[in-house]
Interface confidence: low
């Protein structure tokens, strides 16, 4: 037999587990007595569709409860096991009040409020985590989830989904628990180019060879579908067609926060008066997107030694 | 002449597969990011895939992702979309094109038809 | 994705007439807009890079103009060979994305 769990005086509604795609009728019987629940709503227990409503429950309401399903060719019996609590006294909710654990690799995650579908709910869901009410803009609910955005280990815990069901003209509280633990796992993010700086100039002598690096970031571990490329006067490099400059391939690198990078370098042999005149994009593609950062260069004043 | 040359196309039943090819000459393919864009019959133009210079960045429309892979040899100066598990609506001409200026498709091929049908 | 409008869808035009193509972008793309033209059974060619660049080649009848979301392509005068189908392409962001096109008719 399935299980299900509700907290004393808050609402319980629970599907009768045979159900599957069934759209036949579904008695309801207490399994020790084979007494039938009624489809009244002036009971606090009662049938409605295939589910069985507690307004509100009751910690004697716990025990064995028998759906069936009556079909023209077949009955289809099933248990379901109702156990109704009290409410901890402490903030400490119980493994046996716990609905699934939640992992998220993702730098954004979002959890989903648990049996919240069975319910006739209205936003806004208030969400708690080990008992606290969520206020940061970090954390944002919508509809059934809890957005959780830049997410870090500091995340990790119980978190609780509060909301109300309404009945006849009465309003229930109905909550529910789980964990969210967040996995050690790379992301992909929309690439960072972190050198050189947007619209940065940058100082060359004219007939000496010039560098510039570009290195941008795509999040943690791999880096797959992901380059960094320059183009002059918005053409690729090797549409060009200047023998003097050149594209280094790129090459991987860590930066101090751990985020996988890449850097091309842009080579050229000898700076002439026309480079000055070019606009360098450095660009940093992946499947998130496209960045792009202009460099210009600048004739290097020489220094007055007056 | 830059040019571009498809090949490969023709007539393949559904869940198929064809590998398509683009030979490239008068130009640095190299270092050229390389494109494939498609046209269905009667419709407007699609992006299907991309690739960097050195192949290490490939890119791909959702529609084809996972059926699709672009692939080039340098040494050889051409381009390949191999495809899988082909639709009913991947039936459209294709399209090889160089990547030149801000993005834009600077370079066309003259384009090779697929048809999947049974 | 960036979605890309173009008006008219299509457009009936005499030799000589000035005709205008636009092009909206459903977020600022800045200045990475492209402008193709398609004649039937050929493929596209390029006219117009970073909005308002004229490919080297093409007619300097054709302009183009417009930065962040509105775009416009611009033909002075018609011309008998003008007549086909035009598309704008974004490639502010990967996925790079067409316009649906417009289809340049004899009156």
């Known amino acids: 037999s399935k299980s299900s769990w509700g907290l004393e005086n808050e609402a319980l509604i629970v599907r009768c587990p045979q159900r599957g795609r069934s759209t036949y009728p579904v008695e309801w019987y207490y399994s020790d007595t084979n007494e039938s629940i009624p489809t009244q709503k002036r009971n606090r227990i009662f049938v409605s569709r295939d589910r069985l409503k507690f307004l509100p429950a009751r910690v004697e309401d716990s025990g064995i409860y028998a759906c069936v399903i009556r079909s023209p060719n077949l009955n289809k019996t099933g248990y379901l096991n109702v156990t109704i609590h009290k409410k901890p006294p402490s903030c400490n909710i119980p493994d046996y009040l716990m609905y699934s654990t939640v992992r998220g690799s993702d730098k954004n995650f979002k959890i989903t409020c648990p049996t919240i579908d069975l319910y006739n709910w209205t936003a806004p869901v208030q969400w708690f985590k080990n008992c606290k009410a969520l206020q940061e803009p970090r954390f944002r609910a919508h509809r059934s989830y809890l957005f959780i955005d830049n997410v870090t280990h500091d995340d990790e815990g119980d978190y609780t989904c509060q909301f109300t069901h309404a009945e006849n003209g009465t309003n229930y509280i109905v909550t529910a628990t789980r964990s969210f633990t967040v996995e050690e796992k790379g992301f992909s993010m929309f690439p960072v180019i972190t050198n050189p700086p947007y619209n940065h100039t940058m100082e060359v002598e004219i007939g000496k060879p010039a560098s510039i690096a570009c290195s941008a970031c795509f999040g943690k571990g791999s880096h797959f579908l992901a380059d960094v490329l320059w183009q002059i006067n918005k053409t690729v490099v090797g549409n060009f067609g200047e023998a003097r400059i050149q594209e280094e391939e790129g090459r991987n690198e860590s930066s101090s926060n751990d985020m996988d990078c890449l850097t091309s370098v842009l080579r050229i042999t000898g700076v002439t008066e026309k480079d000055l005149s070019l606009e360098y994009d450095c660009l940093a593609l992946n499947l998130h997107g496209m960045i792009r950062h202009t460099i210009r260069l600048r004739r290097k004043q020489p220094i007055d030694h007056r | 002449e830059v040019q571009l040359l498809e090949s490969g196309g023709g007539l393949v039943q559904p869940g198929g597969s064809l590998r398509l090819s683009c030979a490239a000459s008068d130009f640095n393919f190299k270092n050229a990011w390389m494109s494939w864009v498609r046209q269905a019959p009667g419709k407007g133009l699609e992006w299907v895939s991309a690739i960097s210079g050195n192949g290490a960045g490939t890119y791909y429309a959702d529609s084809v992702k996972g059926r699709f892979t672009i692939s080039r040899d340098n040494s050889k100066n051409t381009l390949y979309l191999q495809m899988n598990s082909l639709r009913a609506e991947d039936t459209a001409v294709y399209y090889c094109?160089?990547?030149?200026?801000?993005?834009?498709?600077?370079?066309w091929g003259q384009g090779t038809t697929v048809t999947v049908s049974s | 994705d960036i979605q890309m409008t173009q008006s008219p869808s299509s457009l009936s035009a005499s030799v000589g007439d000035r005709v205008t193509i636009t092009c909206r972008a459903s977020?600022?793309?800045?200045?990475?807009l492209n402008w193709y033209q398609q004649k039937p059974g050929k493929a596209p060619k390029l006219l117009i890079y970073?909005?308002?660049s004229l490919r080297s080649g093409v007619p300097s009848r054709f302009s183009g103009s417009g930065s962040g979301t509105d775009f416009t392509l611009t033909i002075s005068s018609l011309q008998p060979e003008d007549f086909a189908t035009y598309y704008c392409?974004?490639?502010?962001?990967?996925?790079?994305?067409f316009g649906q096109g417009t289809k340049v008719e004899i009156k």
């Open positions: 094109a160089r990547v030149g200026e801000t993005g834009a498709f600077d370079i």
């Open positions: 970073d909005a308002s």
């Open positions: 977020q600022s793309i800045s200045s990475y």
């Open positions: 392409q974004q490639s502010y962001s990967t996925p790079p994305t």
